[in-house]
Interface confidence: medium
């Protein structure tokens, strides 16, 4: 806490300028004038003020704002973005994108702070959902803010918001993040011809039920097995030896390779050892000829 | 089918602005990614930057902020990028493009030349 | 950023003869995202390969694409006449896209 002393003769500042920058803590504390600092927050970031007099101007729009800043101050914060603690951010309500840009390009270049979570957090909410103009914005700053939200907060991304989504946007999502997205990239692309619309819907194809590998097997599509590796186990089980060749086409030699990790591990265990052996690659561990095949799922469900 | 029509050539002093435009056709503009690249004669192709116009939302190649700046309007469907502060540097083709998964479609290309 | 790097930048080719030309990308591109261009003097960027392997539309059969990871080509089995031209590879997987500077093919 800064103590309140008289400003000296002459030194009140009639404007944010440079000169401000000779001023010790205590008369920066005493001249300047919070309002006029308010009105002229834009010229803060040309000076090339201390840490130590920034925490004092911050201290000023604090007295002048306690229930938190007006927009009209928060987007020319500036480097004085970074003297915020998330209590400071959550009194705010930032409604203007231009706000979010101006205060994440002062954040550019490091990892997503506390500060900047709970900054895009309050911008979020404010709009209601995730729109396109919001996320187009927020992936460009950090490509993984996609991957960070949790499947109920994906829920409010609109499908049309996924052509703004880029293949590096979803390098870290999880397969429950994928089921989300999934249906709602499948909308967006509908109207692509086949070959564009597999390498759009590729990135989002961990969240990708069976019945869409087996149609997606149909089109000629040549899977590489970076993104087979990466589909539900589930969803690639009950697909036959025949539409996994189709589906990787001339991939498919991939196979021996990924043989002990899932879901390729768990997909041999359930096909017939005649029909990998048609493939032609030496995988093993298929149900032996002549083993009745059952299934306890259909048996359990109709006990 | 799809085309992209571009506006014709322009010769414009240094320091001026120029408005390229690219009009759309025979397919939905809002839906797919309007690229800008820029080719100066000899030299290879450069991303300028994107435009999505159903949004509006827009991606820069950070060589090119400041300098390149990306509209669009969906009733003509016609997408439009203005160059500031021009200097010989940006003498060039300028080519838009539609992007889905690739750069599928390309303009004919625009012209600009930039001399006193 | 990701940087391409093609060579040779220029080659020049006999009719008939087997072309191979190389795209280097500086980090790792998933081989969905690596296309190739054909340019003609005059004529805007056709394009000529995508997701690495499949040939676009009108494409001969001779020309055909390769690779993974950081690196790729493009081939044709038996050059002929229509071929030259300079061919760009390009990335569409993290942004800003680039493109590669090109390969000029020449007849020889």
């Known amino acids: 806490e800064v103590e309140k002393t008289a400003c000296p003769s002459g030194k009140k500042a009639p404007e944010i300028d440079e000169s401000l920058i000779f001023y010790k803590k205590w008369e920066l504390e005493a001249c300047v004038d919070a309002a006029l600092l308010a009105t002229q927050m834009d010229r803060v970031n040309a000076i090339p003020f201390t840490y130590e007099q920034l925490d004092v101007l911050k201290h000023k729009l604090d007295e002048l704002y306690p229930q938190g800043y007006p927009e009209s101050v928060i987007q020319h914060l500036g480097y004085l973005f970074l003297k915020m603690s998330p209590e400071d951010i959550r009194k705010w309500n930032v409604t203007s994108l231009e706000t979010l840009k101006a205060l994440l390009e002062v954040n550019k270049g490091h990892e997503m702070s506390p500060q900047v979570a709970t900054l895009i957090d309050r911008f979020v909410k404010g709009r209601g959902q995730l729109d396109k103009d919001t996320l187009d914005t927020l992936t460009a700053f950090y490509p993984g803010y996609l991957c960070s939200l949790s499947p109920e907060e994906l829920s409010s991304v609109p499908p049309s918001s996924i052509w703004a989504v880029r293949p590096q946007d979803l390098d870290t999502c999880d397969p429950r993040q994928l089921d989300v997205l999934y249906p709602k990239a499948r909308l967006a692309f509908q109207n692509m011809n086949g070959s564009e619309y597999f390498v759009k819907i590729q990135s989002f194809l961990g969240g990708a039920p069976t019945e869409d590998l087996k149609a997606l097997s149909q089109q000629n599509v040549s899977m590489d097995l970076a993104t087979f590796m990466k589909l539900r186990t589930d969803a690639v089980l009950p697909l036959t030896v025949a539409e996994v060749q189709k589906l990787l086409g001339p991939h498919v030699e991939g196979l021996k390779a990924e043989e002990r990790h899932r879901p390729v591990r768990d997909w041999i265990l359930r096909q017939r050892q005649d029909d990998l052996d048609t493939l032609g690659l030496g995988l093993q561990g298929g149900i032996p000829n002549g083993y009745l095949v059952l299934d306890l799922s259909m048996q359990e469900a109709l006990s | 089918q799809v085309q992209l029509q571009q506006s014709g050539a322009e010769l414009m002093k240094p320091g001026a602005s120029v408005k390229l435009s690219c009009k759309a056709t025979g397919y939905t503009f809002t839906g797919y990614w309007i690229e800008w690249v820029k080719q100066r004669p000899g030299h290879g192709l450069e991303w300028i930057g994107e435009i999505l116009p159903g949004s509006g939302s827009t991606n820069y190649n950070e060589k090119f902020k400041g300098k390149a700046t990306f509209t669009a309007d969906t009733s003509s469907n016609t997408a439009y990028m203005q160059l500031s502060s021009l200097t010989t540097e940006d003498s060039a083709i300028y080519y838009c493009a539609r992007a889905g998964a690739w750069f599928a479609y390309w303009g004919q290309g625009t012209l600009v030349t930039v001399s006193a | 950023q990701i940087v391409l790097t093609q060579s040779p930048a220029i080659m020049s080719a006999s009719l008939g003869e087997r072309v191979t030309m190389t795209c280097t990308a500086s980090?790792?591109?998933?081989?969905?995202?690596l296309h190739w261009y054909q340019q003609k003097p005059g004529s805007s960027p056709k394009l000529w390969t995508y997701s690495t392997s499949n040939l676009a539309s009108g494409v001969p059969a001779r020309f055909s694409g390769s690779g993974s990871g950081t690196s790729y080509s493009l081939t044709i089995s038996s050059m002929e006449a229509e071929d030259a031209a300079t061919y760009y590879c390009?990335?569409?997987?993290?942004?800003?896209?680039?493109f590669g500077g090109g390969t000029k093919l020449e007849i020889k």
């Open positions: 980090s790792s591109v998933s081989s969905s995202y």
């Open positions: 390009h990335q569409y997987h993290r942004s800003p896209w680039t």
